[in-house]
């Protein structure tokens, strides 16, 4: 029977800069029941606070709701592991909410085959930013990535769309059914999950352009 091993806070994520959650990995438990507590203070403060919500984020997590989340202040936090034989602390972690944003996937993905008379046909893809992200404030620059593949293919073809919310693809295999997905990331955050797939049938008379 030993004191607990050193825990590590390994992940913090925010869907929208208004709330965030951090997760830790326990160290060894020393063969005894171990209690974990996360304490934090904000830059410019000395007063330590305990995690406001150990439930919402699941096991070994701390969730900071709206009233506990500030974009203006860096959070300095650590986890304490305690059993009957003693305690151990994680390294201090510094968190700036701006840099942990992982948005929800983009919405309203629409895919359409366009066949103008005077130009090559193309696949037109359009989507909307996730609802929780307020782009009007200028705090967010969202970048988008599209992936598509024929239904039975193994490899995805990936296109970086930058900040635009629509995209044209010219090179497609006629007669094939394609899966299309889109994801987004803030300029200094994390990629969202891929949106649910949209399927599109490419007509047999679609002229492939290399």
């Amino acid at each position: 029977q030993l004191p607990p091993g050193k825990p590590e806070i390994f992940k913090c994520r925010s869907p929208n800069k208004e709330t965030f959650t951090c997760w830790w990995r326990p160290g060894t438990d020393g063969g005894l029941p171990t209690n974990y507590s996360l304490t934090y203070h904000r830059e410019g403060e000395t007063l330590m606070h305990e995690c406001p919500d150990y439930i919402t984020g699941g096991p070994n997590s701390c969730h900071f709701g709206k009233q506990y989340t500030s974009m203006w202040r860096t959070y300095i936090m650590m986890v304490n592991a305690t059993n009957q034989m003693g305690s151990s602390f994680s390294d201090e972690l510094y968190v700036d909410v701006t840099y942990i944003v992982q948005p929800d996937p983009p919405l309203e993905l629409a895919v359409e085959v366009k066949q103008p008379e005077d130009r090559k046909p193309y696949l037109w893809i359009k989507w909307s930013p996730p609802t929780l992200i307020d782009l009007k404030t200028g705090w967010f620059t969202l970048l988008y990535e599209i992936r598509l593949k024929p239904e039975k293919a193994a490899e995805w073809e990936i296109h970086f769309a930058g900040q635009q919310t629509e995209f044209k693809i010219l090179s497609l295999h006629p007669g094939q059914k394609y899966l299309v997905q889109v994801r987004c990331k803030p300029d200094h955050g994390y990629w969202s999950a891929w949106s649910p797939a949209t399927f599109i049938q490419i007509p047999s008379d679609f002229t492939m352009n290399d």
Epitope: K11, R25, E43, G44, Y94, V95, D96
Partner: antibody, heavy 118, light 112 residues
């Protein structure tokens, strides 16, 4: 203890490439961005670019775009910086540095001296 | 790119005396999120840089309280209230509000 251990000094010919490694330990490698910063002899510091090891997403200083490639190998917890088309002005100490969930550098490697000379 | 200008280039200080380093940026360092990402690093002789101050005025873990940072917008200052022998080295200001991140040219602090 967080450590960033870099590869040893290199001497290179103009026009060639160099690849510097930065092995991370003491933390979960995929959690934090790794940055590369260089320092020419007797000069200031110059940020070259950064990588998110979780998905290898990179941002580069446009000054080096096309010449620098930053990569990360999750299996060995190692980040790499490759600089091509070397010239004498690239003679410098190259540092890797790690952020927290922030955009400033809390931990630094010991530096790797790259000398470009014919 | 944002140009960071430090003054003075070098500083010779008597132990126990104060020292002050100025850093000016070519554009405002206030981020669109309201934060100011201006930091100070110290590079001791033969060592890698180390973080002293983050976001203008916040001391990093383990940094003695004789170091303090202040300023806003484009003008910033690092003060050492009582210089000690271990404070010798080159001090750099750095901004990470705008990409690419940039550094000042450095201020060399020596002991008289």
């Amino acid at each position: 203890e967080v450590q960033l251990v870099q590869s040893g000094a290199e001497v290179k010919k103009p026009g060639s490439s160099v690849k510097v490694s930065c092995k991370a330990s003491g933390y979960t490698f995929t959690s934090y961005w790794i940055h590369w910063v260089r320092q020419a002899p007797g000069q200031g510091l110059e940020w070259m670019g950064e990588i998110d090891p979780s998905d290898s997403y990179t941002n580069y200083n446009q000054k080096f775009k096309g010449r620098v490639t930053i990569t990360a190998d999750k299996s060995t917890s190692t980040a790499y910086m490759e600089l091509s088309s070397l010239r004498s002005e690239d003679t410098a100490v190259y540092y890797c540095a790690r952020s927290f969930f922030t955009n400033w550098f809390a931990y630094w490697g010991q530096g790797t001296l790259v000398t470009v000379s014919s | 790119d944002v140009v960071m200008t430090q003054t003075p280039l070098s500083l010779s200080v008597t132990p126990g005396q104060p020292a002050s380093i100025s850093c000016r940026s070519s554009q405002s360092l206030v981020h669109s999120n309201g934060n100011t990402y201006l930091h100070w690093y110290l590079q001791k002789p033969g060592q890698s840089p180390q973080l002293l101050i983050y976001k203008v005025s916040n001391r990093f873990s383990g940094v003695p309280d004789r170091f303090s940072g202040s300023g806003s917008g484009t003008d910033f200052t690092l003060k050492i209230s009582r210089v000690e022998a271990e404070d010798v080295g080159v001090y750099f200001c750095s901004q990470s509000t705008h990409v690419p991140f940039t550094f000042g040219g450095g201020t060399k602090v020596e002991i008289k």
